[in-house]
């Protein structure tokens, strides 16, 4: 039978940023196809990405139903053109993924500085509240909606003329910092979830500097 050429998937890996979640695996199929199933620890299996030749499956729609749940996925291998066929034990070959808890493990996406405004020796820096694919009452939630006070932002700021950084922290999306009059500053923000043990930090936002378009300056 053709099942002898079927190989089990391996290196099952969750790739997730701001809850956009894709399961990836190997190998590239040769004369075989894959189907993915996902479930919570206590739930039923749901099939996705039926008989695909891809080596990835977007599971976002499933995990956003409850981002605090722990999910397990499995990838089934079938002979191409004979998907009813089973392995030697009467079951199709499959491999389990590692467990995945989106709330604890999704990577924090790169934040964006929305604006900054200087009023005298104070600068207000605002971080864009990025939309996620998590829904509540038919509306998409922002990162802040999902994480609440668990999500903080660290602002790194420095005089354009030097490299030494200062820091500020906020559990909103706004910073109010003191600056020296007549000096231009640059800013970069980082999202952080301190309650995590891994994947705690995002990559830094693009650097924004005073004297560029994003900001506004008012002399008081």
């Amino acid at each position: 039978s053709g099942t002898t050429n079927t190989v089990a998937a391996y290196n099952l890996t969750w790739k997730s940023t701001n809850f956009k979640t894709i399961l990836e695996w190997e190998p590239k199929p040769v004369n075989q196809v894959y189907t993915v199933q996902i479930s919570t620890k206590s739930g039923d299996w749901k099939s996705k990405c039926f008989y695909t030749t891809d080596t990835e499956c977007d599971l976002t729609d499933e995990i956003v139903k409850d981002v605090k749940q722990t999910y397990l996925a499995r990838v089934f291998s079938y002979p191409a053109g004979n998907v009813e066929s089973t392995g030697s034990a009467g079951e199709p070959l499959y491999e389990n993924s590692p467990e995945f808890t989106p709330y604890l493990e999704t990577n924090l996406g790169q934040p964006t500085i929305q604006s900054f405004e200087q009023v005298g020796t104070k600068v207000n820096v605002t971080v864009e509240d990025e939309r996620t694919l998590v829904r509540r009452n038919n509306t998409f939630l922002s990162l802040r909606d999902v994480f609440g006070k668990d999500l903080i932002y660290t602002l790194y700021y420095w005089k354009s003329s030097s490299s030494g950084k200062k820091t500020a922290k906020t559990n909103t999306n706004e910073f109010l910092i003191d600056v020296d009059k007549g000096e231009n500053y640059c800013f970069s923000v980082q999202a952080v979830i301190p309650s995590r043990t891994v994947n705690r930090k995002s990559t830094d936002s693009p650097v924004e500097c005073m004297g560029q378009e994003k900001g506004e300056f008012r002399e008081i």
């Epitope: 891994v198 930090k201 990559t203």
Partner: antibody, heavy 121, light 107 residues
Framework: EVQLVESGGGLVQPGGSLRLSCAAS????????IHWVRQAPGKGLEWVGF????????GYADSVRGRFTISADTSKNTAYLQMNSLRAEDTAVYYC??????????????WGQGTLVTVSS | DIQMTQSPSSLSASVGDRVTITCRAS??????VAWYQQKPGKAPKLLIY???FLYSGVPSRFSGSRSGTDFTLTISSLQPEDFATYYC?????????FGQGTKVEIK
């Protein structure tokens, strides 16, 4: 078990250089922030600078800016303090410390044992 | 830079005494204050973070409180192992700054 171990201290002449290491174990430095603090003999604690090993961003006290450089090698899970143009007033025990946050409030929960730097001719 | 003015600089007390150390910030630092204990020849140890939260493993006789820009470390009943120097520290802005220290000595 979380541990920070400093090394590299010693006697150096004024104007000389020294590189201190802070080797971390039990945690991944890129998930945290590392600060350097010093304490002159019989004196209080003075912040020297910090690094975010995740992005390499650093900040320094005015007293050392331009002379000291903090770096990190995440593959070795180690932070460094390169000290140049050393002065007698830099004589101190140097500590590295791990910083974490409770919501937005920072705290330094683990410290190294310290390494003594003596600047004298 | 924010100044942290700590008082007293030293105090003498007996085992069982209630000891209070205060720190005043030169401007608002919200709750971004930590307290550390240091013994001679040793690294500082974290006692209190976020003004009033007891760090894991620290005896419950230690407590911290905040009133505006005034911060207090209290040892409810001094034990022999508590004789040490105590530092407050603000993390609200860069640079983080320490108080001058309070040496608690045996009376």
């Amino acid at each position: 078990e979380v541990q920070l171990v400093e090394s590299g201290g010693g006697l150096v002449q004024p104007g000389g250089s020294l590189r201190l290491s802070c080797a971390a174990s039990g945690f991944t430095i890129s998930e945290y922030w590392i600060h350097w603090v010093r304490q002159a003999p019989g004196k209080g604690l003075e912040w020297v600078g910090f690094i975010d090993p995740y992005n390499g961003y650093t900040g320094y006290a005015d007293s050392v800016r331009g002379r000291f450089t903090i770096s990190a090698d995440t593959s070795k899970n180690t932070a460094y303090l390169q000290m140049n143009s050393l002065r007698a007033e830099d004589t101190a025990v140097y500590y590295c410390a791990r910083a974490d946050y409770y919501y937005v409030d920072e705290y330094w929960d683990y410290w190294g044992q310290g390494t003594l730097v003596t600047v004298s001719s | 830079d924010i100044q942290m003015t700590q008082s007293p600089s030293s105090l003498s007390a007996s085992v069982g005494d209630r000891v209070t150390i205060t720190c005043r910030a030169s401007q608002d630092v919200n709750t971004a204050v930590a307290w550390y204990q240091q013994k001679p020849g040793k690294a500082p140890k974290l006692l209190i973070y976020s003004a009033s939260f007891l760090y894991s493993g620290v005896p419950s006789r230690f407590s911290g409180s905040r009133s505006g820009t005034d911060f207090t470390l209290t040892i409810s009943s001094l034990q022999p192992e508590d004789f040490a120097t105590y530092y407050c520290q603000q993390h609200y802005t860069t640079p983080p700054t320490f108080g001058q220290g309070t040496k608690v000595e045996i009376k």
